[in-house]
Interface confidence: low
């Protein structure tokens, strides 16, 4: 049968097995979770994208699967990222009351995952899938991350990190969904700081990345919000992440592994 | 605290089937899954799969799929294994065994385990 | 399926001394900084016992003489000092994926 073809690459094989024993999974070691039933999960995860045109995906059509997700995270617990997911989920697993989006349950559903349906029929297209630049943006993946993340971003409280990767040539970047979704979806009502980790990638990088243009604009946009931004360098992401795991080590300095703070009003 | 308590042994003929029950106490049972494992004479130990009590989801081992079906009971508390079609290799003893972790789950309550001997 | 190689198949050792057994996958078992590794002991006609979690993290009521380390796709398990009652089986156990998979087991035995 004739499908459309797109540029990007087809739902992720197994993706209805997958999304099952992975809800299975969490529920199942989640003890707040465990009134989820996850066919009910999968059924609106489905619904949300099985025989829809998947260039024409609504942040609606996900509405009933957060509504079954509904998740909240304690003050001062939230870790955002951008473009360093690997370093923060490293992060999260060894300070465990900390959560980024992948460790709530509809982001560790979909994590790494592609997904996309057709126009009237009820297949799941594993062929191919609507590329955010050359096919469209509404498509079924971008939309889901766009509406979880705003969630997120929404009922998040107290002290806000952000987890930034310095080596990259924009720290900040406004096109990120961190600074078009997440940045824009802070509640100044409820958060009282973002403070931003800026992650440096060489060794003997001794640079404050803190005083980057990017990171300024950052701090511009949040102190428009009405949001204080306070940033910090993490010039050695491994000694950190040991420092976390063991905060007692003697080389462990006082602080987040000999970072320097910058306070912003 | 949590308990697993497993059916008494089996000796079963060669082509029938058996099932074994594991019956759970001192948690909700429909909050977590519970896995079988296998243990041949000899031969160390096999992941054969779990079930999902709160909605019966399964995932099995492909090994073992087609031949074991793992079912529950919720209000009973009991899980259940059956293994169809037995040969002489299926002569093992049969534990269940829940999770407990963190994110990712290991092996923290066991059944006694059930011995089946599958007759000629 | 990821295959687990423990050594040696047997240890024959005296109280009082150290057993360090050895576990390596076929592939790397890490994921976002954990090994997905775990160690079980048993002893005939019982369940196995967790030991150790996520490679090196020691089970409630485990003692101290019991230690796990490793990364990627090589694990161990040190026992030291021996006591009498630590003469058993010892699993390895990997659940990064599906199916998860147990070692052939090392047999650790009073000489």
């Known amino acids: 049968r004739w499908r459309q073809q797109w540029s990007g690459s087809g739902t992720t094989s197994r993706f209805p097995e997958t999304v099952l024993a992975r809800c299975v999974k969490y529920t199942e070691v989640h003890p707040e979770m465990r009134h989820v039933d996850c066919q009910s999960v999968w059924d609106a995860f489905k619904g949300a994208f099985i025989s829809k045109y998947p260039c024409n995906i609504t942040e609606e059509d996900y509405q009933p699967l957060v509504k079954l997700g509904t998740q909240t995270v304690p003050c001062n617990k939230t870790l955002l990222w951008s473009r360093i997911k690997d370093l923060a989920h490293q992060f999260t697993q060894v300070q465990r009351d900390m959560f980024t989006l992948e460790d709530m349950l509809l982001g560790y559903l979909a994590d790494d995952l592609t997904w996309c349906g057709e126009f009237n029929t009820f297949e799941i297209n594993y062929q191919s899938c609507p590329d955010w630049r050359k096919d469209c943006s509404n498509n079924p993946v971008s939309v889901f991350w766009k509406t979880v993340s705003r969630r997120f971003a929404e009922t998040a409280c107290g002290v806000v990190h952000v987890m930034l990767n310095g080596s990259r040539s924009k720290i900040f970047d406004k096109n990120s969904t961190f600074g078009s979704v997440e940045v824009h979806n802070l509640q100044p009502e409820k958060v009282q700081a973002l403070e931003a980790w800026v992650i440096h990638g060489g060794r003997e990088d001794s640079r404050d990345l803190c005083q980057d243009p990017t990171i300024k604009e950052l701090e511009s946009i949040i102190s428009k919000r009405n949001i204080r931004f306070f940033c910090k360098n993490i010039y050695r992401p491994d000694k950190f992440l040991q420092c976390v795991k063991n905060p007692e080590d003697s080389s462990c300095l006082s602080g987040i592994s000999a970072s320097h703070h910058h306070h912003h009003h | 605290q949590v308990q697993l308590v497993q059916s008494g042994a089996e000796v079963v003929k060669s082509g029938a089937s058996v099932k074994v029950s594991c019956k759970a106490s001192?948690?909700?049972?429909?909050?977590?899954?519970m896995h079988w494992v296998k243990e041949a004479p000899g031969q160390g130990l096999e992941w054969i799969g779990y079930?999902?009590?709160?909605?019966?989801?399964?995932n099995y081992n492909q090994k073992f799929q087609g031949r074991a079906t793992l079912t529950a009971d919720t209000s009973a508390s009991t899980a259940y294994m059956e293994i169809s079609s037995l040969r002489s290799e299926d002569t093992a003893v049969y534990f269940c065994?829940?999770?407990?972790?963190?994110?990712?789950?290991?092996?923290?309550?066991w059944g006694q385990g059930t011995l089946v001997t599958v007759s000629s | 399926d990821i295959v687990l190689t423990q050594s040696p198949a047997t240890l024959s050792l005296s109280p009082g001394e150290r057993a360090t057994i050895s576990c390596r996958a076929s592939?790397?078992?890490?994921?976002?900084?954990?090994?997905?590794m775990h160690w079980y002991q048993q002893k005939p006609g019982q369940p196995p016992r967790l030991l150790i979690y996520?490679?090196?993290s020691r089970a409630t009521g485990i003692p101290a003489r019991f230690s796990g380390s490793g990364s990627g796709t090589d694990f161990t398990l040190t026992i030291s000092p021996l006591e009498p009652e630590d003469f058993a089986v010892y699993y390895c156990?990997?659940?990064?994926?599906?199916?998860?998979?147990f070692g052939g087991g090392t047999k650790l035995e009073i000489k």
């Open positions: 996520l490679a090196s």
């Open positions: 592939e790397s078992v890490d994921s976002y900084g954990n090994g997905f």
């Open positions: 001192g948690y909700t049972f429909t909050s977590f899954n």
């Open positions: 079930i999902y009590p709160g909605n019966g989801g399964t």
């Open positions: 156990q990997q659940n990064k994926e599906d199916p998860w998979t």
């Open positions: 065994a829940r999770t407990g972790g963190l994110r990712r789950a290991y092996f923290t309550y």
